[in-house]
């Protein structure tokens, strides 16, 4: 028997309740932002909650439907992109998710000017990506992996590609490991600002190996999936940039772009583009040993209607503590000059920071320091340069917004949100219209979310987008739990933690406690953001105390524990979770008889090797969809942080650093162990073969798959997973259901 | 090169006005700002004040506000500090110098020898 | 106006040592900026928007900090780094303000 405290104090309290685990699973305590769909400097396009499109101007005050909701739902639109020269709408239905950012779509053209669809020369479908140019009404699409470009709408499609093949060459289209682990997007092409030109990437996946996996659906045979997927060591795509004149694409045709020489010696990557002029282009690329990043801005000769690319454009950045840059490597925000930009790369002491880069990287100007991280920058004007930093009170785990005057007069640093809420708003993001002349913020947290209007040049609120209201009420009656973030130092070492309490906590009792983590490389937990989660309901009802902890290898703290991983991931995370768990049990109100650990993706590698390090320390654990072994892993993301599965390389750590390797070790521990079938990112393969040393190491476990679906184990499948991850744990922590 | 020439003394009697002057060469004076700082014999630096030559606007440190005037003879390329009813306090070396703005330097990147002014009866 | 509090007034090194020398503004600055000055000459820039080199000074020579709390650093103390360095900065501006100044003596 449990005996609880009786919680009758006063009746307010009385009137409180616990979260509860449907609260969490209906997403009864979730959370809106506002990010505004800019259209110039002063007007933005919103999706009304009855979806209308509305177009609001700031400095009118005025508003107006450009598009109703009964011509959304002719077409059972639920996404929509207004041309820039405001005569079109294409409407987006028919969405099918593919892989991370990727999906397909049908797409129709809507005329703003006659109230019509366009017909004639309708587009195909489905359509794997399609934009607007940046000025006028010029439409590119990707269809069947071959880039498409009509002048107006409805024009007969000019086919740019005529390669693009299922699996083997993508035209405008990243295939599975560029969307995922370097690009980031759904998409592989790029106009210039002014719409002259569309530059875009080949994809030859020709000799990737393949992973297959079974899709069980509802048919009498399984079908099998395909995705051309380098692991760890593997062959990698071969990637090429091309630049077309959307002018006259017949005239020349596309036009390749050349690889730096230093590039081009051995495997490489392209990382990613940007235009600076309509006449000049920015490409990045990446050795395939990812410490080495050449940026290479090349220029357009009319003359010969190529692109140049001179060896004096050229600026590398190297790292000679761990691999370039933080996840990515950062891409540059270029000057009114059009020569001189902005990046974030680690400054001498390394920490990243503002570099201002003129002519080379060697006389690159830094324009942030200290020991903290600039993060983001958001934009640059004549006049200012807006970017995110954690250097307000020196808590890492925050995000505040920056402006640094650069204009005819001292530079000069203002935070702008470090005040605005101080107690809510601790985690911002910011979206800017044109020349920031006006600009949106957005609050995470910790406290409930807020998104508001700002004046560019003043800062000035102009109004609140979204304030959460029926959250904040719905929130008034339920006992949230505490949270504290806080630092433990351990040999030189500074561990940032979030501890979740119960509502009631007590530091005179022992509690449950939970480990909650990812530890990834460059990721970070420890956040000031509001969040009701499972978590949240762990504490607030079921009592448990539940931590994250920041440990080496995580971001925005310096390289020194960024970089601590490179090449050993799987020891320095796991470590470091095992000597917070020691620090949380001398603070005395840990039941150190009941803690457990859990974490999905890299998350569920570190959870399972934490249950397998014979600390004694953990009762039981969850890992859900972890790696196993980092061989079989996706090489961009692999081999940044670990170099190759060779044995003049790497390859004995490959080996060492197995979930496979430490089975014996499962013996006194709870297990439970869970996948996706059909996960294309961390493949079902990697639980298999943990399944496996385990039953052939003779240790008893608990294991859970889900068929059918993928990384993310979405819709009835979350509902049946926390469910059951909450008995597990309800179970090993002798709580009564 | 870039050189910013100065007198070397200056002797001015108590209550007298003495006009320093800062001849630019190598660049034309009317380019950048000019700033004037004082140094006392074994003491810090002290701002005085700055003239932008293009246009003849000036700042001055509240402290030099009257004592100080700033000038720009931009046909000889030379910039002058007028220093009126001196006193023993005002006996120090006063440089010129000019601040590199172009972006993100912002420092004073050139600096005249200085002029020693002694202010004795 | 902003003060700035530079320490220790004057300190002495031995070659080879590190050196670490202080500035405190009384209210937080965006940026520091360093002068190195010695006898009978005229002030040198050294560091600008507080980490940046100045043309021509020795790598050995570092700027830091943020807010209130900046410092200049010389890896490895040489003969020729015996002078008097000055901070400096804009954020009050106008007036600009200098520290009043660090000696540093070669041991």
């Known amino acids: 028997i449990v005996l609880r405290p009786s919680r009758v104090h006063n009746s307010e309290e009385n009137t409180m309740r616990a979260l509860t685990l449907k609260d969490i699973l209906n997403g009864t305590f979730s959370y809106k932002t506002f990010f505004p769909n800019w259209i110039s400097g002063q007007e933005y396009l919103h999706q009304s909650a009855d979806n209308n499109i509305v177009l609001y101007n700031i400095e009118t005050g005025q508003s107006y439907t450009i598009l109703s909701n009964r011509t959304m739902k002719s077409v059972n639109a639920s996404n929509y992109g207004l041309s820039p020269d405001r005569q079109f709408v294409y409407l987006e239905s028919d969405y099918s998710k593919l892989w991370r950012y990727s999906y397909t779509a049908t797409y129709y053209i809507y005329d703003l000017s006659n109230g019509e669809f366009v017909r004639g020369n309708e587009l195909p479908r489905p359509i794997q990506y399609l934009c607007w140019s940046p000025v006028g009404s010029k439409l590119a699409y990707v269809y069947q992996n071959n880039i498409y470009l009509k002048q107006r709408p409805g024009d007969p499609p000019f086919q740019i590609t005529f390669n693009g093949r299922e699996n083997k060459i993508f035209n405008g289209i990243p295939d599975w490991v560029y969307e995922e682990e370097m690009l980031a997007t759904k998409y592989a092409l790029w106009w210039s600002p002014n719409g002259k030109f569309l530059a875009y990437a080949e994809f030859n996946d020709t000799d990737i190996p393949v992973i297959a996996y079974s899709y069980y659906g509802d048919e009498q045979y399984p079908r099998t999936i395909n995705i051309p997927y380098p692991k760890a060591g593997a062959k990698n795509p071969v990637v090429r940039i091309f630049i077309i004149d959307t002018t006259y694409p017949a005239y020349v045709g596309p036009q390749e772009v050349p690889v730096p020489a230093m590039i081009a010696s051995s495997d490489y990557y392209f990382s990613w583009l940007t235009w600076v002029t309509d006449e000049r282009v920015c490409l990045q690329w990446l050795k395939r040993v990812q410490n080495v990043s050449v940026l290479s801005i090349c220029d357009f000769r009319e003359d010969w209607q190529t692109w140049d690319c001179p060896k004096t454009q050229e600026h590398i950045e190297e790292s000679r503590t761990g691999w370039a840059g933080g996840f990515f490597v950062s891409t540059p925000v270029f000057s009114y000059d059009a020569i001189s930009y902005y990046k974030i790369f680690s400054d001498k002491d390394g920490y990243k920071h503002i570099h201002y880069i003129k002519d080379t990287v060697e006389n690159a100007i830094q324009i942030t320091s200290g020991k903290w991280e600039a993060i983001n920058i958001f934009r640059v004007t004549q006049d200012s340069l807006f970017y995110s930093s954690n250097e307000f009170e020196e808590y890492p785990g925050r995000r505040n917004i920056y402006r640094i005057s650069i204009g005819s007069y001292p530079p000069s640093k203002k935070c702008v949100t470090c005040h605005l809420r101080k107690e809510r708003c601790q985690y911002y993001t910011a979206s800017f219209s044109d020349y920031a002349k006006y600009y949106a913020l957005v609050c995470y947290g910790p406290g409930i979310p807020i998104s508001t209007l700002h004046d560019g040049r003043t800062d000035q609120e102009i109004k609140i987008l979204e304030e959460n209201k029926e959250l904040e009420n719905a929130l008034k009656n339920i006992q949230l739990p505490k949270e504290e973030i806080k630092k433990l130092e351990v040999d030189e070492i500074t561990l940032w933690y979030k501890m979740i309490l119960p509502p009631q906590f007590d530091r005179s009792k022992k509690y449950p406690l939970l480990i909650q983590v990812y530890g990834g490389p460059c990721s970070q937990s420890v956040r000031s953001v509001f969040a009701v989660n499972w978590i949240s309901y762990l504490a607030s009802k079921e009592g448990m105390v539940i931590a994250l902890v920041d440990g080496r290898g995580t971001a925005f703290q310096g390289d020194k524990l960024l970089y601590a991983v490179y090449r050993k991931l799987g020891v320095y995370e796991v470590e470091d979770q095992i000597t917070a768990v020691r620090k949380f049990i001398e603070m005395g109100f840990i039941d150190e008889k009941r803690i457990a650990i859990w974490g999905w993706s890299y998350g569920g590698y570190v959870s399972s090797l934490a249950l397998a390090s014979g600390t004694g320390l953990f009762k039981c654990g969850i890992a859900v969809a972890p790696v196993s072994s980092w061989e079989y892993y996706a090489s961009v993301y692999t081999e940044r942080f670990m170099g190759l599965p060779t044995k003049d390389d790497n390859l004995e750590h490959y080996k060492n650093s197995t979930v496979m390797a430490r089975a014996e070790y499962f013996r006194n521990v709870d297990y439970l162990l869970i996948h996706g079938t059909a996960d294309d990112n961390v493949h079902f393969q990697n639980s298999a073969q943990i399944a496996k040393a385990l039953v052939n190491a003779q240790v008893d476990f608990q294991a859970m798959w889900y068929s059918d679906q993928n990384h993310g184990l979405s819709g009835l499948s979350t509902n049946h997973l926390y469910t059951h991850m909450t008995h597990f744990l309800k179970q090993c922590f002798s709580l009564s259901d | 090169q870039v050189q910013l020439q100065q007198p070397g003394a200056e002797l001015v009697k108590p209550g007298a006005s003495v006009k320093l002057s800062c001849k630019a060469s190598?660049?034309?004076?009317?380019?950048?700002?000019l700033h004037w700082v004082k140094q006392r014999p074994g003491q810090g630096l002290e701002w005085i004040g700055e003239?932008?030559?293009?246009?003849?606007?000036?700042n001055f440190s509240e402290k030099f506000e009257i004592k100080a005037t700033l000038t720009v003879d931009s046909s000889s390329n030379t910039a002058f500090m007028q220093l009126s009813r001196l006193t023993s306090e005002d006996s120090a070396v006063y440089y010129c110098?000019?601040?590199?703005?172009?972006?993100?330097?912002?420092?004073?990147?050139?600096w005249g020898a200085g002029t020693t002014v002694t202010v004795s009866s | 106006q902003i003060v700035l509090t530079q320490s220790p007034a004057l300190m002495s090194a031995s070659p080879g040592e590190k050196v670490t020398m202080t500035c405190t503004a009384s209210s937080s600055v965006s940026y520091m900026y360093w002068y190195q000055q010695k006898p009978r000459s005229s002030p040198k820039p050294w560091i600008f928007?507080?980490?940046n080199l100045a043309s021509g000074v020795p790598a050995r020579f570092s700027g830091r900090g943020s807010g209130t709390s900046f410092s200049l650093t010389i890896s490895s103390m040489e003969a020729e780094d015996a002078a008097t360095y000055y901070c400096q900065q804009w954020s009050g501006y106008p007036p600009i303000t200098f520290g009043s100044g660090t000696k540093l003596e070669i041991k």
């Open positions: 190598g660049y034309t004076i009317t380019s950048y700002s």
């Open positions: 003239i932008n030559p293009a246009n003849g606007d000036h």
């Open positions: 928007l507080t980490s």
């Open positions: 110098t000019r601040l590199d703005d172009s972006r993100f330097h912002w420092y004073f990147d050139v």
